[in-house]
Amino acid sequence: GDLLIQKTIKKQVVLEEGTIAFKNWVKTGTEVYRQFWIFDVQNPQEVMMNSSNIQVKQRGPYTYRVRFLAKENVTQDAEDNTVSFLQPNGAIFEPSLSVGTEADNFTVLNLAVAAASHIYQNQFVQMILNSLINKSKSSMFQVRTLRELLWGYRDPFLSLVPYPVTTTVGLFYPYNNTADGVYKVFNGKDNISKVAIIDTYKGKRNLSYWESHCDMINGTDAASFPPFVEKSQVLQFFSSDICRSIYAVFESDVNLKGIPVYRFVLPSKAFASPVENPDNYCFCTEKIISKNCTSYGVLDISKCKEGRPVYISLPHFLYASPDVSEPIDGLNPNEEEHRTYLDIEPITGFTLQFAKRLQVNLLVKPSEKIQVLKNLKRNYIVPILWLNETGTIGDEKANMFRSQVTGKIN
């Protein structure tokens, strides 16, 4: 009996036309939502003039439906038992699941000012930037709508650069009508224990953002894992959002709509400094902001963002060192709300429910030559927003799953 079930499972989780896995893999049957909370800065003038702590107040959720588009350019390679694809990006605002509209205004860090002053650190160009910032009446902070902040706006300061430069700025710009990939993953035909594991991303087995093992593309994309998941396993996955591979460990048994699933969570150790977790040494890319690699809980992904000083963390700086959150007032981290988890059906390896949480921050530093940054006396890793991307198997799919998979085993 068990062998027959194993055989059936192995057959059905292969990523090829005709299997249950393939159908759900090409286009997820789960509704996925991405909720945003924006950190509205309450005291922009005091920060700019006196280098005060930044007082933030989160506003949200603002909810978008995401991951509703089918994978594109799906191409099987029989020779190396892989399937390649592009994951198209799309986001549709859901007013009924949001506290306001996309036209709501927020006071946030001026993305262009912070980024340009970081990218061009030489004194001469900073003098030029100062002229452009002043002329455009830009400042350290700006007021932007939700739509502008997320999806892009024409920046008045960058628009003054007399060369062809990208003048559109947005945390997720460009997003709609773009795609992530190309991913090339093992289809499991020859070896089911490799199914969904990424072979290459954008044609490479490494990212070129990090040193050593940190640069590896490990595991799957977290939508599924090879079948017969054990509680003792460390589940590796790659997330292009954070420009790195990461891992999850078993936390608890959960009953999801009558289906027994394993809850895997991202442990605090994954965000630890190299002092506590030596494996993380290669995620420490500079010595000043990281206080000689002793700070933890923030990841400098600037190399992955064309030099823009983007730092990824968990929401409200959960699992981050006190020095990171010290200059920011108004944060209240808690595990239940702010950690990432995956609920995995162990027999198939399918992720039936998940909550992926992350925070986007931008570094801003004092600059002697840029007037609006001149009075700063310290570096700030400024929280801009945090997001919660969730998906749960639908009732109909859950019934099907219970009858066809877990019911048969029990």
Epitope: Q123, I128, P162
Partner: antibody, heavy 117, light 107 residues
């Protein structure tokens, strides 16, 4: 086509004044800012002054600070270098040059300033 | 101020020769270095910016390398029109400063 044309050079006595002009075409000087660079006879290049984009700040080499003033008239798309209290060591060919990121991609033909009694 | 020290101050070479001119900055200027060519009685012409980026219209026999404090301009195969004086310049900090020049003469 980008062009810079200097004028206003000539012979002047020590302690005298001269005003150089730099007429630009093919680009807006306000967007780039303008530099003056000089070259004494048989010598190398020396940066003299800069007016930052959009009528921004002005900057000078220590050797001319307090004596030279750079300015621009954006309506005429022309930059100026007012030179007062001239000295023999100010004798040079004066070039105006376009730059944004600090390297000079276009230069004028130069105008000779001779300070001699 | 950042000093730019060029060497040699002059050199003699023949058509077809590979010529290398070096420039040393008194402090780190990252890649913010430009190179110019100047012929007698003419204004300088930009060859290279950002230490390695060839300016449009400049022949590919000219190349730049270096970062930090040490920079090189190389002419892979000297042509008759290349006999001139060459200057390096740092565009990292004000005041912008030039090297003293290297005169490339016919051997």
């Amino acid at each position: 086509e980008v062009q810079l044309v200097e004028s206003g050079g000539g012979l002047v006595q020590p302690g005298g004044s001269l005003r150089l002009s730099c007429a630009a075409s093919g680009f807006t000087i306000a967007a780039f800012g303008i530099h003056w660079v000089r070259q004494a006879p048989g010598k190398g290049l020396e940066w003299v002054a800069w007016i930052a984009p959009y009528g921004g700040d002005t900057y000078y080499a220590d050797s001319v600070k307090g004596r030279f003033t750079i300015s621009a008239d954006t309506s005429k798309n022309t930059a100026y270098l007012q030179m007062n209290s001239l000295r023999a060591e100010d004798t040079a060919v004066y070039y105006c040059a376009r730059s944004f990121f600090g390297y000079f991609d276009y230069w004028g033909q130069g105008t000779l300033v001779t300070v001699s009694s | 101020d950042i000093q730019m020290t060029q060497s040699p101050s002059s050199l003699s070479a023949s058509v077809g020769d590979r010529v290398t001119i070096t420039c040393r900055a008194s402090q780190d200027v990252s890649n913010w270095v430009a190179w110019y060519q100047q012929k007698p009685g003419k204004a300088p012409k930009l060859l290279i910016s950002y230490a390695t980026s060839l300016y449009s219209g400049v022949p590919s026999r000219f190349s730049g390398s270096g970062s930090g404090t040490d920079f090189t301009l190389t002419i892979s195969s000297l042509q008759p029109e290349d006999f001139a004086t060459y200057y390096c310049q740092q565009h990292s900090n004000a005041p912008l400063t030039f090297g003293q020049g290297t005169k490339v003469e016919i051997k």
